[in-house]
Amino acid sequence: QDPYVKEAENLKKYFNAGHSDVADNGTLFLGILKNWKEESDRKIMQSQIVSFYFKLFKNFKDDQSIQKSVETIKEDMNVKFFNSNKKKRDDFEKLTNYSVTDLNVQRKAIHELIQVMAELSPAAKTGKRKRSQMLFRGRRASQ
Amino acid sequence: QDPYVKEAENLKKYFNAGHSDVADNGTLFLGILKNWKEESDRKIMQSQIVSFYFKLFKNFKDDQSIQKSVETIKEDMNVKFFNSNKKKRDDFEKLTNYSVTDLNVQRKAIHELIQVMAELSPAAKTGKRKRSQMLFRGRRASQ
């Protein structure tokens, strides 16, 4: 059994999250993960999910009663999601820590936007453009 | 030329982000993207970058002078990053909108944690466990 299981059960008790009523009104993450089988699609979703958990854990960093559980789970996330690669984890952490209200960060983000956009689709790297990548505009285009 | 280029140039003017001094003290996103060649690694990073831009654009949604530019860029992000797939974009949006301070959300997240963790590594789906997935702790362990 992976180390995180016991510690996650401990967190369930702490957050009173073991009751069946918690599952009312659908799931947060599991239903979404079920929708995506393609590895790169899953990574898009899991990236948001992992950053959510890291934020959640940060909010409880001063609560000693769950520190060991939180640390064990974070470590196992490092192992599983970042494949034990500290550089990958550090780069991810940098991205999640940028403040969207910081004026210098805003300027930098806009400065880099064209190059970021150019790299967004896998096709960008091969120079080929996917057939689906045309600009459709319509009633619900700007979401 | 993709539609976003002209509009991104417009945003550069608005944010005063065209000056060379903006690049001082390194990049936000470009340096990180350069580190990752593997598609699934890139998606992990790009997921955070795209959510950053969406948050940034949301903060300026009432500024009429840049609305057209913002909408065009968002559309092109939908096309490039979500491959024009509205469901993918909607699921992504749901994940980015969960509030980490909402008690019900916290309980649900902890309730789902074990299953989310079980799906985190690509190996999880095949039942194989990667050799590198071992738990080491050290000086800079709990970041």
Epitope: P3, E75, N78, V79, N83, S84, N85, K86, K87, K88, D90 | K34, N35, W36, K37, E38, D41, K130, R131, S132, M134, L135, F136, R137, G138, R139, R140, A141, Q143
Partner: antibody, heavy 120, light 113 residues
Framework: EVQLLESGGGLVQPGGSLRLSCAAS????????MSWVRQAPGKGLEWVSA????????YYADSVKGRFTISRDNSKNTLYLQMNSLRAEDTAVYYC?????????????WGRGTMVTVSS | NFMLTQPHSVSESPGKTVTISCTRS????????VHWYQQRPGSSPTTVIY?????PSGVPARFSGSIDSSSNSASLTISGLETDDEADYYC????????????FGGGTKLTVL
């Protein structure tokens, strides 16, 4: 002061066994992964094995897998390397090293090393 | 597993600048941190650069590390060379792609003329 002190090296015949120890002091031993790195005479560094802080996870280089066993006793602040079926190519200075960050990234503290000679 | 290749030896005069390269054979050099160790004759290795370009306290600013994706290599640069810098230098990275543990370069002997 943070210190690592290796012992247990010596001369052993091919096929023989030896147990190396590494006594740690000056830091919370159980909080750190530890590793063994060796250096053959006149040659470069070669990573041998590593163990997690709790001792629950171990890891080996292909060249020693099945012959060497890493272990630790956190109550004694000591790291061990049990070496069996020794070969001439295992002749080297064996360094005990502290792993500097989570997983196997860098080694921030090294011992002085203990010499192992495998010869008939 | 990938390999890390370093020049066998380099030499330079005191006060000058020297750069030691470390080239990764497969996979991207940028996808794992690179660390550098100094080993003086008869001594244990000590870290001079960790995580690509970070210096441990006590290591002078004359030592710097960098990564170049185009050549798939890392570099250790020592400026204002001192006779005391004469030593073997090793680069090291972790193989998390193929789960091969820790990889060291073959080492570079720096001679200060």
């Amino acid at each position: 002061e943070v210190q690592l002190l290796e012992s247990g090296g010596g001369l052993v015949q091919p096929g023989g066994s030896l147990r190396l120890s590494c006594a740690a002091s000056g830091f919370t031993f159980s909080s750190y992964a530890m590793s063994w790195v060796r250096q053959a005479p006149g040659k470069g560094l070669e990573w041998v094995s590593a163990i997690s802080g709790s001792g629950g996870s171990t890891y080996y280089a292909d060249s020693v897998k099945g012959r060497f066993t890493i272990s630790r006793d956190n109550s004694k602040n000591t790291l061990y390397l049990q070496m069996n079926s020794l070969r001439a190519e295992d002749t080297a200075v064996y360094y005990c090293a502290r792993v500097g960050s989570w997983y196997l990234e860098d080694f921030d503290i090294w011992g002085r090393g203990t010499m192992v000679t495998v010869s008939s | 597993n990938f390999m890390l290749t370093q020049p066998h030896s380099v030499s330079e005069s005191p006060g000058k600048t020297v750069t030691i390269s470390c080239t990764r054979s497969s996979g991207s050099i940028a996808s794992n941190y690179v660390h550098w160790y100094q080993q003086r004759p008869g001594s244990s290795p000590t870290t001079v650069i960790y995580e690509d370009n970070r210096r441990p306290s006590g290591v002078p600013a004359r030592f710097s590390g960098s990564i170049d994706s185009s050549s798939n290599s890392a570099s250790l640069t020592i400026s204002g060379l001192e006779t005391d810098d004469e030593a073997d230098y090793y680069c090291q990275s972790s193989d998390t792609t193929y789960h091969g543990g820790v990889v060291f370069g073959g080492g570079t002997k720096l001679t200060v003329l």
